[in-house]
Structures are given as structure tokens and as C-alpha cells.
């Protein structure tokens, strides 16, 4: 998303005008942040605290189990992606506080926001991979019995990370530092300059591969899984439905503003009022998308079977039960079964 719509710490919200009147200074300074930026800062702060602590805990719990439990491999990769994304938040936070001034230099401008994107897309694509895994568990149990192993799970994760890297390359290549003459400020953003077609292509590819395709995968997989599990009286439950709806809805809700504004801006002239309005909302859209980075640990805890009873346990042991459990498969973006004793269990208890 283009980021060249920001004001400066020195001159605040500079309001330009088209008349030369020496008696009326054009410099209308204000060091107050815009409302969308304040909201973004609040969200960033909450996401950082919950995301770093929650994902660190998940990494700690799953790291020991990742060699033998496929569940743990999924959770570990998701948590690493989210954790790394959260670590970059203080930089975004600092930039917004300084009215989007970028004091970190050109190399940081290319690398840091690109790392954020890399990890965000890795999270999305891993969710799609997990949902595909669940689909296979339900509909191809014999294939899973024969081929579903830790090695394949790691390969699937590597593919997800690789695709995330590919999605991030355009952002990395076109990301530049621009120093504006007045008001004096340094901005970090994506600049396609002459190539509006390429900007649109990047936005469309990002929308399809980073949003629509995973969303479609999740929706289809969970719809089929629901239909199969609901057809068996023993596994029919409202909790399953709630978790599945939470998975798809949270993904859709939190990424939608970022993707919609991104695609709209790629088709608008940078000087148009709509573009400028959307660009003012950019930080808020990014922060909204960032909620995905802290929502996983929350879902892991809330969706744990017998949650009420487990509250008395310590958080690590609660997470261990949820994340490395092998006897029951749960319906969320975070719950996938790795091994079960019998194929009957595999198809009945998903």
C-alpha cells in the first residue's frame, strides 16, 4: 500500500492553499495525531502485548513437540510468523507517533515493512495449509494414514513461507525513502512512479493469493468438514460451528479493510480526494490486519475443550493440552489432529 500521505513532526498538518496572501500564513501547524492514527496506535499496543506474550508462549509449548506432533508443527509456524510480525510493531508505532516520519533509514525502510508483510502472508497461507490438512484428515483418512507425516508438514510450511516471500518481493523492490522538501520529513513507502499497471498487478495478485484464495480454501474446507461432522450425531455440536465461523470471520474481517483499500488505491490517482482519504486510513487498516497476529493464541485458549474446567490449570499446561493433543481433532484454524489410534476415530471426531 502506498504510504506517501503523511504529515511531519515539525510542521504537523500542513494545510496547503493556492493563493499567495502574505498576510495569512499558509503554515497551519498542529502536532495532534489524526483519529485513525490514534486508534491504530491503541490497536498496535494491544496486539504487541498480547501477540508477543501469547505467541512466545505458543512457540515455547510447541517447540518441544514439533518433532513428533504434526499439530505442533502448524502451531509453531503460525506462532513464529505472528511473533515476528509483532516484534516489528514498535517500529511502526514509533513512526506513527512521529506523524509517519521515518527516522530508520533506507535499508530499514526496504527490509522492516517487507518482513512484516512476509510474516503476515505466511500466517495467512499457513492457515490455508492447515485447513487443507484438516480436509484431508476427514475425506482422505487412508491417504493420511500412509503419507501424513512430520516431513510432509514441514515441506507444506516451507511452501507457505516461500509463497509468502514471493508475495513480499514487489513490496521490497518498490519500497523507497522519500524526503519531502516541505514540510520537511522523510517518508517510507512504496513508489511505483511511472508504472501504475505494475502497481495494480501487485495489488491484484496480493488480493487473490493473500486473501481471496486462502479465504476460499478456508470456507470450502470448513463447509465440507462441517457437513461431514454434522452428519454424524456423535460429533454434532454448536461449539464446532462457532469455532469454524470464528476462524473464517476473523480472517475475513481483519484483512478485508487492508485489501480493499489497497486495491482501490492502486486504481486511483494519488492526487485524488478518495486516494488521500484512503491513505489517511492506511495505518488503521494495517493495525486492523495486525489483530490476526494476536488472535490465534486467544482462539487456542478459548476454543480448548473443557475450557471452563481448565482455567484452574496454568496457561502453559492449558496450551500444551490444546496444541499437542492427539486424541481429539478440533475445528478451528488452530486445531488439527496429528495421529489417532484408529481410522474410525479419525473420521468420527474431527
Amino acid at each position: 500500500m502506498n504510504s506517501f500521505n503523511y504529515t511531519t513532526p515539525d510542521y504537523g498538518h500542513y494545510d496547503d492553499k493556492d493563493t499567495l496572501d502574505l498576510n495569512t500564513p499558509v503554515d497551519k501547524t498542529s502536532n495532534t495525531l489524526r483519529v485513525p492514527d490514534i486508534l491504530a496506535l491503541v490497536i498496535f499496543a494491544v496486539v504487541f502485548l498480547v501477540g508477543v506474550l501469547g505467541n512466545a508462549l505458543v512457540v515455547w509449548v510447541t517447540a518441544f513437540e514439533a518433532k513428533r506432533t504434526i499439530n505442533a508443527i502448524w502451531f509453531l509456524n503460525l506462532a513464529v510468523a505472528d511473533f515476528l510480525s509483532c516484534l516489528a510493531l514498535p517500529i511502526l508505532f514509533t513512526s506513527i507517533v512521529q506523524h509517519h516520519h521515518w527516522p530508520f533509514g533506507g535499508a530499514a525502510c526496504s527490509i522492516l515493512p517487507s518482513l512484516i508483510l512476509l510474516n503476515m502472508y505466511a500466517s495467512i497461507l499457513l492457515l490455508a495449509t492447515i485447513s487443507a490438512d484438516r480436509f484431508l484428515l476427514v475425506f482422505k483418512p487412508i491417504w493420511c494414514q500412509n503419507f501424513r507425516g512430520a516431513g510432509l508438514a514441514w515441506i507444506a510450511c516451507a511452501v507457505a513461507w516461500g509463497l509468502a516471500l514471493l508475495l513480499t518481493i514487489p513490496s521490497f523492490l518498490y519500497r523507497v525513502v522519500r524526503e519531502e522538501y516541505f514540510p520537511p520529513k522523510v517518508l517510507c513507502g512504496v513508489d511505483y512512479s511511472h508504472d501504475k499497471r505494475r502497481e495494480r498487478a501487485v495489488a491484484i495478485v496480493r488480493l487473490v493469493l493473500g486473501f481471496l484464495w486462502p479465504l476460499l480454501t478456508l470456507t470450502i474446507c470448513y463447509t465440507f468438514i462441517l457437513l461431514r461432522t454434522w452428519s454424524r450425531r456423535a460429533t454434532r455440536s454448536t461449539k464446532t460451528l462457532k469455532v469454524v465461523v470464528a476462524v473464517v470471520a476473523s480472517f475475513f474481517i481483519f484483512w478485508l479493510p487492508y485489501q480493499v483499500t489497497g486495491i482501490m488505491m492502486s486504481f486511483l490517482e494519488p492526487s485524488s480526494p478518495t486516494f488521500l482519504l484512503l491513505n489517511k486510513l492506511d495505518s488503521l487498516c494495517v493495525s486492523f490486519a495486525y489483530i490476526n497476529c494476536c488472535i490465534n493464541p486467544i482462539i487456542y485458549v478459548v476454543a480448548g475443550q473443557g475450557f471452563q474446567g481448565r482455567l484452574r490449570k496454568s496457561l502453559p499446561s492449558l496450551l500444551r493440552n490444546v496444541l499437542t493433543e492427539e486424541s481429539v481433532v478440533r475445528e478451528s484454524k488452530s486445531f488439527t489432529r496429528s495421529t489417532v489410534d484408529t481410522m474410525a476415530q479419525k473420521t468420527q471426531a474431527v
Epitope: 502574505l22 503554515d27 522519500r178 516541505f182 492526487s271
Partner: antibody, heavy 119, light 112 residues
Framework: QVQLKQSGPGLVAPSQSLSITCTVS????????VDWVRQSPGKSLEWLGV???????KYNSALKSRLSISKDNSKSQVFLKVNRLQTDDTAMYYC?????????????WGQGTLVTVSA | DVVMTQTPLSLPVSLGNQASISCRSS???????????LHWYLQKPGQSPRLLIY???NRFPGVPDRFSGSGSGTDFTLKISRVEAEDLGVYFC?????????FGGGTKLEIK
């Protein structure tokens, strides 16, 4: 009426320093930026730097190590100092202002100071 | 730095005819506030440059309406609808969106 008047030496020896003064009238330096631009013989214009109303300065990175811009608000004067002059610093030096942070481009210009760097 | 490329280098024109000068920037000149800080100057022999057009199309006070500016993003044009003798000189385009502000190489308008 807005005016910018320049004063400074016409001939400077290589490796010496150049100092030019720009005295403004018709506006206050406390809320207006003043830029310095030079034009080598038969060539285009080159921006050297700016001093904003709040005293913040910005220089052309290619010349940053040799340039210094300062001002005296009470005297309505802006000063340009160029150190370690070389023969290719021979140019017409202008002070200019956009006024009122308007960024309309350089609306008002000084008459220029022709500086020749020669032994 | 933003490179400003002006064409043509020299423009012979008959008095009363239209003249058109093109200016292209190496980067987008759209400022983060939505404005485009592309300006046009005229420099007559032995004089300081004079601002004609600011922010792409706005005429500076006192500039005749035969001067007009247009363009967006990276491509800009200055048009003089009916060239008069007093219009002769070197025309420069310049940007003050990014640091450092940069100028085009100049276009010399001369009588054919």
C-alpha cells in the same frame, strides 16, 4: 513590497571561503524559508539549501560538507557560506523565497551574486 | 535526486504562434498532501529567474493568461498560446516536492 538583495565578493581564490548575505524586506524571516540556488555559466540551476522560518536547515547532499546557511531574524538577513571553493564553484548565486511555507516554488529572487573562483 | 528532463532544448517559434515545452520527472512528484509541486520559470538574459506557474497549473500573480500549465505524476507541459517578443528567454521546469529541489536543463525559446 517583497525584495531580496544580495551582497558579497565577486572574486574568490581557490580553497578560500565564500560568504554571501541576502537582506530581505516585505516579509519576516521568522515564518518564511529562504533558499539558495546557483547557476553555473551556460548551465541549469542547482539548489544549494534552505533555512526555514524556525531555523531548520537542509542542504544539497552533494555539497553538504562545504555549505552553511544561517540567519539573523532581527536584521532580516540570511547568510550563505561555502568553504574550500574550487573553480567549478564559479556561478551566479541567488537567494530565493517561496514565502509563508507555501511551497509555491521560488516566488521571489535576489538579483544574484556572480562569484568567480580564480587564482 | 529527481532528474527533470526538458524537451526540446531549443524552441524556434514565430510570434503569435503557440509554443509547447515538455518536462518529465524521474519520480512521481505527487506530495503526500496530494499536491504536485512542479513549477515553471522564465529567465531572461542577465536577469534572475521569474516564477510563471506554480503547482502544475496555477499562474503566479501578474503572469499573462496565455501561459498555461498541465500534467500529472511525472509528465508536465507548459503552453504559451500566442508567443510575444517579451516571452523570449530560457524556460525551466522545477520540482519542490522532494529534497533536493531540482531543475530541468532549460528550453530556449527563440524567434524563428
Amino acid at each position: 513590497q517583497v525584495q531580496l538583495k544580495q551582497s558579497g565578493p565577486g572574486l574568490v581564490a581557490p580553497s578560500q571561503s565564500l560568504s554571501i548575505t541576502c537582506t530581505v524586506s516585505g516579509f519576516s524571516l521568522t515564518n518564511c524559508g529562504v533558499d539558495w540556488v546557483r547557476q553555473s555559466p551556460g548551465k541549469s540551476l542547482e539548489w544549494l539549501g534552505v533555512i526555514w522560518g524556525d531555523g531548520l536547515t537542509k542542504y544539497n547532499s552533494a555539497l553538504k560538507s562545504r555549505l552553511s546557511i544561517s540567519k539573523d531574524n532581527s536584521k532580516s538577513q540570511v547568510f550563505l557560506k561555502v568553504n574550500r571553493l574550487q573553480t567549478d564553484d564559479t556561478a551566479m548565486y541567488y537567494c530565493a523565497s517561496a514565502l509563508d511555507y507555501s511551497n509555491f516554488g521560488f516566488a521571489y529572487w535576489g538579483q544574484g551574486t556572480l562569484v568567480t573562483v580564480s587564482a | 535526486d529527481v532528474v527533470m528532463t526538458q524537451t526540446p532544448l531549443s524552441l524556434p517559434v514565430s510570434l503569435g504562434n503557440q509554443a509547447s515545452i515538455s518536462c518529465r520527472s524521474s519520480q512521481s512528484l505527487v506530495h503526500s498532501n496530494g499536491n504536485t509541486y512542479l513549477h515553471w520559470y522564465l529567465q531572461k538574459p542577465g536577469q534572475s529567474p521569474r516564477l510563471l506557474i506554480y503547482k502544475v497549473f496555477n499562474r503566479f500573480p501578474g503572469v499573462p493568461d496565455r501561459f498555461s500549465g498541465s500534467g500529472s505524476g511525472t509528465d508536465f507541459t507548459l503552453k504559451i498560446s500566442r508567443v510575444e517578443a517579451e516571452d523570449l528567454g530560457v524556460y525551466f521546469c522545477a520540482q519542490s516536492t522532494l529534497v533536493p529541489p531540482t531543475f530541468g536543463g532549460g528550453t530556449k525559446l527563440e524567434i524563428k
